[in-house]
Interface confidence: low
């Protein structure tokens, strides 16, 4: 019979014959011959192949490097790669999450407009008049100045974007 020029799904053409691809989780050791089928071996620990393939080497599972702020979100198997995410306080620098950068803290005088997520950084905003932040934080919003009136007190020291107002007792001598 004529040698094939194309093969079925999950096969590949080699030496004028169709050989079976190795299934996910296995790598190619030997091509098939007219006498033997394709020889495949399972991937080792910490290795994977996620498609029907003719690879001679399995891929290493992604390493979620804590030095780069990464941690394991989903452990890899022989058929799937490890999925990394960022440690709390970090966010991915790309969709593939190959490395992380630390969430920025908002300096005193600035509050958190949007808390950082695993994929986006902290968004800071200046504290408007009537609000303050006296800490460097990746979570704290600007706090409103204390309302002295509601406590039956008066403002002794005006607030700033970094400090709260200071309340004190009413001057009782005033009519």
């Amino acid at each position: 019979p004529e040698p094939p020029t194309a093969c079925r799904e999950k096969q590949y053409l080699i030496n004028s014959q169709c050989c079976s691809l190795c299934q996910p989780g296995q790598k190619l050791v030997s091509d098939c011959t007219e006498f033997t089928e394709t020889e495949c071996l399972p991937c080792g620990e910490s290795e994977f192949l996620d498609t029907w393939n003719r690879e001679t080497h399995c891929h290493q599972h992604k390493y979620c490097d804590p030095n780069l702020g990464l941690r394991v979100q989903q452990k890899g198997t022989s058929e799937t790669d490890t999925i990394c995410t960022c440690e709390e306080g970090w966010h991915c620098t790309s969709e593939a999450c190959e490395s992380c950068v630390l969430h920025r803290s908002c300096s005193p005088g600035f509050g958190v407009k949007q808390i950082a997520t695993g994929v986006s950084d902290t968004i800071c905003e200046p504290c408007p008049v009537g609000f303050f932040s006296n800490v460097s934080s990746a979570f704290e919003k600007c706090h409103p100045w204390t309302s002295c009136e509601t406590k039956d007190l008066v403002v002794q020291q005006a607030g700033t974007n970094k400090t709260d107002v200071v309340c004190g007792p009413q001057d009782r001598l005033r009519a």
Partner: antibody, heavy 115, light 110 residues
């Protein structure tokens, strides 16, 4: 436990280059970045840059951009730091260290630049 | 990147506590909780004693503690011992895959 073993001391002429090696053992070579730090005699520590052995990606301190090259050889689990256009003020002990945190250090390599 | 600012020297008697400061900017120390401290004895490589602002690697005694406020990080060595006499360096992540060190502080045990 990761161990980092560096090449021996070097004496170089001004204008020449030096290539320092750092061989890693223990742990998976491709699973951690390597930082390079130098310390001039009687001076403080100075971060020069890093290389991620898994992909070979590098990041260099601005001061050394264009003069430093960090490479790796995965077959021998070794990273290299080459510094060119040497000047007497490059005389220092050069260290490799694991990761940005630098939690494991090599023993250091003294590079002397003198005419 | 400018070096972080540390006092050149600090001292204390055995059993006392001493605190070393490390001042950066809102782009390094103030922006990231990624400050480390290293101890270096003469002729030796530095040794990590604090990372991520306040965490101690296993094997480092709890006499070493650290904190951060704004753009300044601090290392406290309590119950001073003779072997604590060494140079101490801080470092901080500075964004963009870069690190920056402090100038170092020589700690003398009187």
């Amino acid at each position: 436990q990761v161990q980092l073993v560096q090449s021996g001391a070097e004496v170089k002429k001004p204008g020449s280059s030096v290539k320092v090696s750092c061989k890693a053992s223990g742990g998976t070579f491709s699973s951690y970045a390597i930082s390079w730090v130098r310390q001039a005699p009687g001076q403080g520590l100075e971060w020069m840059g890093m290389i991620n052995p898994s992909g070979g990606t590098t990041s260099y301190a601005q001061k050394f951009q264009g003069r430093v090259t960090m490479t790796r050889d995965t077959s021998t689990s070794t990273v290299y730091m080459e510094l060119s256009s040497l000047r007497p003020e490059d005389t220092a002990v050069y260290y490799c260290a694991r990761g940005f945190r630098m939690d494991q250090w090599g023993q250091g390599t003294l590079v002397t630049v003198s005419s | 990147q400018s070096a972080l600012t540390q006092p050149p020297s600090a001292s204390g008697s055995p059993g006392q506590s001493v605190t070393i400061s490390c001042t950066g900017t809102s782009s390094d120390v103030g922006a990231y909780n990624f400050v480390s401290w290293y101890q270096q004895h003469p002729g030796n490589a530095p040794k990590l004693i604090i990372y991520d602002v306040r965490k101690r690697p296993s094997g480092i005694p709890d006499r070493f503690s650290a904190s951060k406020s704004g753009n300044t990080a601090s290392l406290t060595v309590s119950g001073l011992q003779a072997d604590d006499e060494a140079d101490y360096y801080c470092s901080s992540y500075a964004g963009n895959n870069e690190m920056v060190f402090g100038g170092g502080t020589k700690l003398t045990v009187l």
